[in-house]
């Protein structure tokens, strides 16, 4: 059951896991979601009523019962952690938080123009936790514009006080703003060879990379698969971290895989849940709960919906079934992670999926598509959306792309002639035009923000974004694409597609199902030679085969060129203009959107 | 946990310079400022000078002349020096870790005395 | 620069009295005044830093109050273990300085 709202002026009693510091009750309920344990909590508001060393702590707390008895206690605030809550949850905290200090370890000191500018320095700082700002009016003279940047063990202040004239807030790596490089690559045979903050065990190196993002303190990993030779050390995840932020040393080891914390590039960030199954796998860990269910997918089932079960393995033996089902065992540990893992057993194992809400939709898993045709299916491209025009009557006008529960990335150029976000409708989830009838439901227009440097489509800025007056219920069929990061600027994008209904030769008409083509990235040196009456920009991106036969074209416009890096789908491009359709060396030119990931995340998170 | 540690010479001659050394542990020096502080024996406490995290430094006006703070991050180690001493030098030297201006820490201190 | 006068050198007192110290400022240091106690062979510990605000630990017994260039430090009930050597500090600006100490000693 999912619980959101916080009881004020009181007090949870007993269940005491740890004890952290929060400024807020609101990012101790985020704390208390992402800790493996925590089902509820307590915070102590800062009152005159309270011991001012009690203030801002924020006890998370467990309990078999899932419940605890409640006591009237004035300025304590309790709720309940949000796993399993199937609204979005996010670690992203962008609030600041006046006239307090956030103690930790201060690692750098400098002067900052602003609180703004020092949140900055901090979000685009690796080791970087949280911040604590003097203003202008520090008492202090000297202290004033001193930009604190600060880190701890735990990722949150180690003491929270009040202090004047400060302000202090949280690294915004969380919130997809961070200009960090990231490597998503993981590195075979290779042990990188650091300090090590902590340990856990984890059945490949996915999870271990995993585990690593959503660790305060981990920077990198390294990763000691099965076959390693030290029996002692297989399966062991080596949280890692170095005072540069990258690994000093690499030593080339056999069996043995590494790999970066992916804290920075939190857009396409894997989510802090694992739903691969591993089979001939145990999971060693504390029981919680056996059960006989029928099959491995409804054990993860029972371990998702019991809210404290964290990992589970299920039996095949025979004397652990009983005609068509098997026992399920429900197992917890201190860290979340199984305290042992052993193969060659009859049996399957995996993690509940309790936090698989959490983080950026954008990234979780897309059906297998189907490679090849040219018509799509249905949930292939659940981001894409058709922009309808009601006036003077209803028609497919360009595409679009989801990219927040409020938001459509299209192209500026589709707006051409109309006068008002009204007689705009979007349909998401939608594989035919001819499902769309007068009844179907359609998300409203509330605002078009086009980019206010477009002219035209072939000088740039060919980008606008669609406020929708709804939220978008994320499904199977309809869910964000994730922006590209500002880090992957020198990826080679290898697996790039163009989607749309539009036409499928330069006199054509809409097409009914949503057509796909795999078209490859072209050098914007390469692009600048086929179109030499025009300037092809950094702001633009182009995609085509030399010969020509597969492009976007009309109605197109607006949609999405969708490129998938190790295993996340990027909205790279969005479909612009060119000369004719699919013709030899004329490729397709696209807005490319990493270059305007900036004016995108100002338009969308505007207050 | 946070530690300063001075060491010094003990006994310097006059008009020779004195370099005192302060250790720091559990924090570091590029998020810290550090002070130095004397005091004379049976007296009050002087305020010398300070080094910032970003490596600026400040000095005491009477003392400027004679002054220099300096640090080596890597080896969290901060550097006082001293030159053309005098018997009134005589002191026990502190360093301090900085607090917003405040002193939140400080060293156990390390005893000079300038005498022939 | 900013000179820093603590007028009592001494200040006789009792366990369970309370006792103020006074610190004066040659100009205005807006609120950013520390106080230290200081016992014999022992470093200066900070007790209340920007006048008012309590260091970690500190019994709250210790308080600060002022602003501009007159400051008072308090204990409102004298134990035993605080006749000790108090110094003000202002760090409004460089080079910060101290007062000369007032030295609690028993009645």
């Known amino acids: 059951e999912c619980v959101t709202q916080l009881l004020k002026d009181t007090c949870f009693e007993g269940g005491d896991i740890t004890t952290v510091f929060t400024p807020s009750a609101k990012y101790c309920q985020v704390v208390c979601t992402y800790h493996p344990r925590c089902l509820l909590f307590t915070f102590t508001a800062e009152s005159p009523s309270e011991d001012p060393t009690r203030w801002f702590t924020c006890v998370l707390k467990d309990s078999v019962t899932e419940t605890l008895p409640r006591v009237n206690r004035t300025a304590a605030i309790s709720g309940y952690s949000f796993k399993q809550c199937s609204h979005q949850i996010s670690a992203c905290n962008k609030d600041i938080y006046v006239d307090l200090d956030m103690k930790g370890i201060n690692y750098n000191s400098s002067v900052a123009k602003s609180a703004q500018e020092c949140q900055e320095r901090c979000t685009d700082d690796v080791h970087c936790h949280f911040f604590t700002y003097a203003t202008r009016q520090f008492p202090s003279l000297e202290h004033r514009n001193i930009c604190l940047l600060k880190h701890t063990q735990t990722g949150t202040p180690t003491r929270i006080t009040k202090l004047d004239k400060v302000v202090s807030g949280f690294s915004l790596k969380s919130c997809a703003l961070s200009n960090l490089a990231c490597i998503r690559d993981i590195f075979p045979n290779t042990v990188f060879a650091d300090s090590n903050i902590d340990s856990v065990m984890a059945p490949d190196a996915f999870v271990c990379g995993r585990i690593c993002t959503h660790h305060p303190g981990c920077l990198f990993f390294t990763f000691f698969s099965q076959e390693w030779p030290k029996e002692s050390q297989r399966n062991l995840c080596l949280l890692k971290t170095s005072e540069s932020g990258l690994p000093s040393t690499r030593i080339k080891k056999s069996k043995a895989l590494s790999g970066f914390s992916l804290q920075s590039c939190r857009h396409s960030i894997p989510v802090p849940c694992h739903s691969k199954i591993y089979p001939g796998v145990d999971f060693g860990g504390e029981e919680l709960n056996v059960t006989f269910v029928k099959g491995v997918n409804v054990c993860q089932e029972t371990c998702t919906k019991m809210i404290r079960c964290q990992f589970f393995t299920y039996s095949l033996l025979p004397e652990d079934c009983k005609e068509e089902k098997c026992k399920c065992f429900l197992r917890l540990s201190m860290d979340g992670s199984p305290t042992r893992i052993a193969y060659g057993t009859q049996g399957s194992s995996g993690y509940s999926l309790r936090l698989c809400n959490t983080g950026d939709n954008c990234t979780t898993k897309i059906k297998p598509r189907i490679v090849g045709g040219t018509a799509s299916v249905r949930g292939e491209w659940p981001w894409q959306v058709t922009l309808h025009t009601t006036s003077p009557t209803q028609r497919h006008l360009c595409g679009g792309s989801i990219i927040g529960n409020q938001w459509i990335l299209t192209a500026a150029h589709c707006f051409y002639g109309v006068e008002s976000p009204k007689i705009l409708r979007v349909y998401s989830g939608i594989l035919n035009q001819s499902e769309i009838k007068e009844d179907t439901s359609f998300f409203g227009v509330q605002e078009i923000i086009i980019h206010d440097q477009y002219k035209m489509a072939e000088s740039g800025y060919d980008i606008a974004l669609l406020k929708l007056e709804t939220t978008v219920n994320y499904t199977d069929s309809q869910r964000p694409i994730c922006l590209p990061s500002k880090g992957d600027r020198n990826v080679i994008y290898t697996d790039c597609w163009v989607t749309g209904w539009g036409y499928r030769k330069l006199r054509d008409k809409i097409q009914n199902t949503l057509q796909k083509a795999k078209i490859p990235l072209v050098t914007n040196e390469e692009c600048q030679k086929r179109y030499r009456g025009h300037k092809i920009t950094h702001k633009m991106i182009c995609a085509g085969y030399r010969e020509g036969g597969k492009d976007a074209c009309k109605g197109d416009s607006g949609g999405p060129l969708s490129c998938k890096h190790n295993e996340v789908w990027h909205l790279v491009g969005i479909t612009s203009w060119g000369e004719g359709c699919a013709q030899r060396e004329r490729p397709g030119v696209y807005t490319n959107v990493v270059e305007y990931v900036d004016w995108i995340l100002e338009k969308t998170q505007a207050v | 946990q946070v530690q300063l540690e001075e060491s010094g010479p003990g006994l310097v001659a006059p008009s020779q310079s004195l370099s005192i050394t302060c250790t720091v542990s559990?924090?570091?020096?590029?998020?810290?400022?550090i002070y130095w502080v004397r005091q004379p024996p049976g007296k009050g406490l002087e305020w010398l000078g300070m080094?910032?995290?970003?490596?600026?430094?400040d000095y005491n006006s009477a003392l400027k002349s004679r002054l220099s703070i300096s640090k080596d991050n890597s080896k969290s180690q901060v550097f006082l020096k001293m030159n053309s001493l005098q018997t009134d030098d005589t002191a026990r030297y502190y360093c301090?870790?900085?607090?917003?201006?405040?002193?939140?820490?400080w060293g156990q201190g390390t005893t000079l005395t300038v005498s022939s | 620069d900013i000179v820093m006068t603590q007028s009592h050198k001494f200040m006789s007192t009792s366990v369970g009295d309370r006792v103020s110290i006074t610190c004066k400022a040659s100009?205005?240091?807006?609120?950013?005044v520390a106080w230290y106690q200081q016992k014999p062979g022992q470093s200066p510990k900070l007790l209340i830093y920007?006048?008012?605000y309590r260091n970690t630990g500190v019994p709250d017994r210790f308080t600060g109050s002022g602003s501009g260039t007159d400051f008072t430090f308090t204990i409102s009930s004298v134990q035993a273990e605080d006749l000790a050597v108090y110094y003000c500090?202002?760090?409004?600006?460089?080079?910060?300085?101290f007062g000369g100490g007032t030295k609690l000693e028993r009645l």
């Open positions: 301090a870790r900085d607090y917003y201006g405040s002193k939140d820490y």
């Open positions: 559990g924090f570091s020096l590029t998020g810290y400022g």
């Open positions: 080094i910032w995290g970003d490596g600026r430094t």
């Open positions: 100009q205005d240091v807006s609120t950013a």
């Open positions: 920007l006048t008012s």
């Open positions: 500090q202002q760090h409004y600006k460089t080079p910060y300085s």
